[in-house]
């Protein structure tokens, strides 16, 4: 397994609709045709997988139908969007990139993007 550098923003603020987007960029040392991108969430020293997708270079990322993630790829950049976030989902979201094929296999893990999610205040009842 060979190491690869992965860069991602340090902080992102989710929109009021619970959507956060960030770019995950990897320094590809090889000529990979198949890339796997995994988003991991680290909170309270526990790491869980949020979503994952394998894609062919030049093609779109395809996450599972029930995934909260969507994404697009362009060269060595992956634009990731996570939806349906709530305040309790605030945490460090780590981008993991694997160059799956052809060999050699490369693995890169970013430092993580701290995503802050603020639940919107409910609209006060208004009398007309």
């Amino acid at each position: 397994c060979k190491a690869m550098h992965v860069a991602q923003p340090a902080v992102v603020l989710a929109s009021s609709r619970g959507i956060a987007s960030f770019v995950c960029e990897y320094a590809s040392p090889g000529k990979a045709t198949e890339v796997r991108v995994t988003v991991l969430r680290q909170a309270d020293s526990q790491v869980t997988e949020v979503c994952a997708a394998t894609y062919m270079m030049g093609n779109e990322l395809t996450f599972l139908d029930d995934s909260i993630c969507t994404g697009t790829s362009s060269g060595n950049q992956v634009n990731l969007t996570i939806q349906g976030l709530r305040a309790m989902d605030t945490g460090l979201y780590i981008c993991k990139v694997e160059l799956m094929y052809p060999p050699p296999y490369y693995l890169g893990i970013g430092n993580g993007t701290q995503i802050y999610v603020i639940d919107p205040e409910p609209c006060p009842d208004s009398d007309f």
Epitope: C1, K31, T33, E34, M100, Y101, P102, P103, P104, Y105
Partner: antibody
Framework: QVQLVQSGGGLVQPGGSLRLSCAAS????????MSWVRQAPGKGLEWVSA????????YYADSVKGRFTISRDNSKNTLYLQMNSLRAEDTAVYYC?????????????WGQGTLVTVSS | QTVVTQEPSFSVSPGGTVTLTCGLS?????????PSWYQQTPGQAPRTLIY???TRSSGVPDRFSGSILGNKAALTITGAQADDESDYYC??????????FGGGTKLTVL
């Protein structure tokens, strides 16, 4: 345990076609790249073709490019080699082989081989 | 066209040590070529001995070892036994999904 069981060999005339199959069991087939390797009578091993675990990436030796097609059906745990425009020099025992682990740096398991004879 | 070279034949005495090599027609073999080694007896499928330069395949005795010696990949067999008499093939990874086998070495134990 890992098993690769091959079928589909036989006698075919020059210019003809043949499809080889390699049925896999004992491992998560879709997680492994696979290759075809052949051996002409009395000769050494020759790598023919490779395919990634998803089936999205394929590679060929120059000697078969444009004539052979590698494919896989992960729902059936089966690897295929479609051989068209066969020539006498394609006569060989054909082996399917699993590429080793996630790093894919070598072949760890082999099928039993199937003989393809191209002759009129 | 890159050619992978091996000694056509080699002989070793029982209990002796033999080193088979795998080179390139032009250039040096390094770990980046992920050399691997296979043993084949007549009429049988190849058996994997070593992959990724020096990793032994499961069930392979530690008499077999892989390394880089100078500008070639090497397979060393220590304490050679009669049933080591076989053909030995190396394969090198050329990048972009392409593998190239050497011509093989016929090892005789006598």
């Amino acid at each position: 345990q890992v098993q690769l069981v091959q079928s589909g060999g036989g006698l075919v005339q020059p210019g003809g076609s043949l499809r080889l199959s390699c049925a896999a069991s004992g491992f998560t087939f879709s997680s492994y790249a696979m290759s075809w390797v052949r051996q002409a009578p009395g000769k050494g091993l020759e790598w023919v073709s490779a395919i990634s675990g998803s089936g999205g990436s394929t590679y060929y030796a120059d000697s078969v490019k444009g004539r052979f097609t590698i494919s896989r059906d992960n729902s059936k745990n089966t690897l295929y080699l479609q051989m068209n425009s066969l020539r006498a020099e394609d006569t060989a025992v054909y082996y399917c082989a699993r590429e080793e682990g996630i790093t894919g740096t070598g072949f760890d398991y082999w099928g039993q081989g199937t003989l393809v004879t191209v002759s009129s | 066209q890159t050619v992978v070279t091996q000694e056509p034949s080699f002989s070793v005495s029982p209990g002796g040590t033999v080193t088979l090599t795998c080179g390139l027609s032009s250039g040096s073999v390094s770990t980046s070529y992920y050399p691997s080694w296979y043993q084949q007896t007549p009429g049988q499928a190849p058996r994997t001995l070593i992959y990724t330069t020096n990793t032994r395949s499961s069930g392979v005795p530690d008499r077999f070892s892989g390394s880089i010696l100078g500008n070639k990949a090497a397979l060393t067999i220590t304490g050679a036994q009669a049933d080591d008499e076989s053909d030995y093939y190396c394969v090198l990874y050329m990048g972009s999904g392409i593998w190239v086998f050497g011509g093989g070495t016929k090892l005789t134990v006598l």
